[in-house]
Amino acid sequence: QNCSGPCRCPDEPAPRCPAGVSLVLDGCGCCRVCAKQLGELCTERDPCDPHKGLFCDFGSPANRKIGVCTAKDGAPCIFGGTVYRSGESFQSSCKYQCTCLDGAVGCMPLCSMDVRLPSPDCPFPRRVKLPGKCCEEWVCDEPKDQTVVGPALAAYRLEDTFGPDPTMIRANCLVQTTEWSACSKTCGMGISTRVTNDNASCRLEKQSRLCMVRPCEADLEENIKKGKKCIRTPKISKPIKFELSGCTSMKTYRAKFCGVCTDGRCCTPHRTTTLPVEFKCPDGEVMKKNMMFIKTCACHYNCPGDNDIFESLYYRKMYGDMA
C-alpha cells in the first residue's frame, strides 16, 4: 500500500462524510476519503482529520503501517460542552475525576465501579441511587419466585472483580492510570485507550491497544441455550487469526469474546489482559501491536446511551486489566 503506484480510486463517487468530518485526500494524494477521527485507526491511505489538528501516531518507527489518530501535543479537549486545556484535571461529575491530555480525556472513577454477578447470597443484584448519595450502591432484590433459587444455584459463580489500580507512590511520583476505555467498536477490530503517568519521567502519556469484543460475522444469538436470555462468553470453535488493515496476525489465537443477550442487557469485557500481537503485512513487513484479550465478560443493564455523559461510556470500560 505504498504511494509509488498509479492512483486509482473506488468506482463509487467521493464518499459523503458525517457532519463535522472532513473530506480529505488520502495520504498518497490519490483519493477523497472521510478523515479518521480522534482515537480511530489510521493508515497511510486513511489519514486523520487535519482540520482538527490530528495526526496518525504509528508508535514505534518499525510499525509504520497502522496507527491511531492522536491530537498534537497540547491540544485541548472538548468534554460536555466545556473546553479543557491539555494537562488540566477536572471532575466531570461527583463520580469521575478526569484529565485532558493532548485532546484525549481519561477518567478515574471516584465510585466503586465493580460489576456484581449473581451469587447464592445475592441472586438478583441491582445498582440503585440512594437519596443524598453520589455513588450508586448494590442492593439485593428478593426473587419473585422462590423456586428459582434452588436448582439454578449451580449456574452462579462468584466472579473476581477489579476496580481501578490502587494509587501508588513511587520516587516522588503519584502514579495514576485511568481505566482502559471501551473498545471503539462493538464488533470487529477497534481500539481502546487510557492515560497514565506510570513511566520513568512521571509524565502523562496516552496508551492504546487493539481490541475485539466480538467478531462482526458471528451470529451469537443462535447459540443462546433454550430458556436462557444471554450467552456471556461464547465458545469460539476454532483458533483464529486477527486481521488489521490487510495484515494478518502471525499466530492463531483461541480468543474469548463477549456474547449477547435477548433481554436488553449488553455483554462487555469484565476482566482483560493486554498482550503483544505480531501482524505480517502483504509486503512482508512485521509490526507488533498491543491487543486486549478478554478473560471474562459480564452481561448487565448498564448499556451505553444512558443520560450521564460519561457513565454511559464508563460502564462499557474494561475492569481489572492484568497487563
Partner: antibody, heavy 119, light 111 residues
Framework: EVQLVESGGGLVQPGGSLRLSCAAS????????MAWVRQAPGKGLEWVAN????????DLLESLKSRFTISRDNAKNSVYLQMNSLRAEDTAVYYC????????????WGAGTTVTVSS | VVMTQTPLSLSVSLGDQASISCKSS???????????LEWYLQKPGQSPQLLIY???SRASGVPDRFSGSGSGTDFTLKISRVEAEDLGVYYC?????????FGQGTKLEIK
C-alpha cells in the same frame, strides 16, 4: 457538452520552452484528474503526465520529469503543461485528456495541439 | 511494462469478426486488485476514444459488438461484426503500473 480545448502549441527551437493550456467545460473540473498524452508524427500514443483533483499530486513520465511540469487551476477550469529545454524528439501532437481516477483513465480527449521543435 | 499488440495491421471484410491481441511484459494487476487494461480507437484524423476499460467493461456509448477479455498478461479485443466506422488504429493501454503505457497500435482496414 463535455469539452477539452488545447492551446499553446507551435514551432519552437531546441532548448526553448512552451506552455500548453487545456480549457475544460461541461463538467465539474475539480472532480476529475487531468492528463497529457502525446503522439509523435506517424507514431503511437505516449502518456506524459497526470495530476490529481487539487494539484497536490502529479505523476510524470520519468524521462520527462526534469523538463516538464503539469499543473492546474481549478478556478479557471484549466490544466497546463510547462515544457522546458525542448528537444526534437518532443515534436508531437499533445492531447489533453480527462482521467476519471476511478474505473477508466482517459474518457474524454481534446482535439490536440501540435508542438514542433526544430531549428 | 511493455505492451505488445498483434497483429500490427488487420484487413477485415464488413460483417466479419476482428480480433486483436495485447500481451503485457508482466502482470498488470494494480495493488488494489483491479486490472486497468483499456482499449482505445483512433479514427483517421481524430483524437483517440475510449472503448473498453478494466479489461471488459464497455465505455458509455460503445456498441456491444466490441468486447474485451483476458487476464494476467494476455488480453483480447473482439469486434463481432465489423462496420465501416470501425476503421482506424486500436491501442491497448495499461494503467496499473508506472509508467502508464500504450501498445504500439493495430491498424484495422476494411477489405
Amino acid at each position: 457538452e463535455v469539452q477539452l480545448v488545447e492551446s499553446g502549441g507551435g514551432l519552437v527551437q531546441p532548448g526553448g520552452s512552451l506552455r500548453l493550456s487545456c480549457a475544460a467545460s461541461g463538467f465539474t473540473f475539480s472532480d476529475y484528474y487531468m492528463a497529457w498524452v502525446r503522439q509523435a508524427p506517424g507514431k503511437g500514443l505516449e502518456w506524459v503526465a497526470n495530476i490529481n483533483y487539487d494539484g497536490s499530486r502529479t505523476d510524470l513520465l520519468e524521462s520527462l520529469k526534469s523538463r516538464f511540469t503539469i499543473s492546474r487551476d481549478n478556478a479557471k477550469n484549466s490544466v497546463y503543461l510547462q515544457m522546458n529545454s525542448l528537444r526534437a524528439e518532443d515534436t508531437a501532437v499533445y492531447y489533453c485528456a480527462r482521467d476519471t481516477s476511478r474505473g477508466s483513465y482517459f474518457d474524454v480527449w481534446g482535439a490536440g495541439t501540435t508542438v514542433t521543435v526544430s531549428s | 511494462v511493455v505492451m505488445t499488440q498483434t497483429p500490427l495491421s488487420l484487413s477485415v471484410s464488413l460483417g466479419d469478426q476482428a480480433s486483436i491481441s495485447c500481451k503485457s511484459s508482466q502482470s498488470i494487476v494494480h495493488y488494489n486488485g483491479n486490472t486497468y487494461l483499456e482499449w482505445y480507437l483512433q479514427k483517421p484524423g481524430q483524437s483517440p476514444q475510449l472503448l473498453i476499460y478494466k479489461v471488459s467493461s464497455r465505455a458509455s456509448g460503445v456498441p456491444d459488438r466490441f468486447s474485451g477479455s483476458g487476464s494476467g498478461t494476455d488480453f483480447t479485443l473482439k469486434i463481432s461484426r465489423v462496420e465501416a466506422e470501425d476503421l482506424g488504429v486500436y491501442y491497448c493501454f495499461q494503467g496499473s503500473h508506472f509508467p502508464l503505457t500504450f501498445g504500439q497500435g493495430t491498424k484495422l482496414e476494411i477489405k
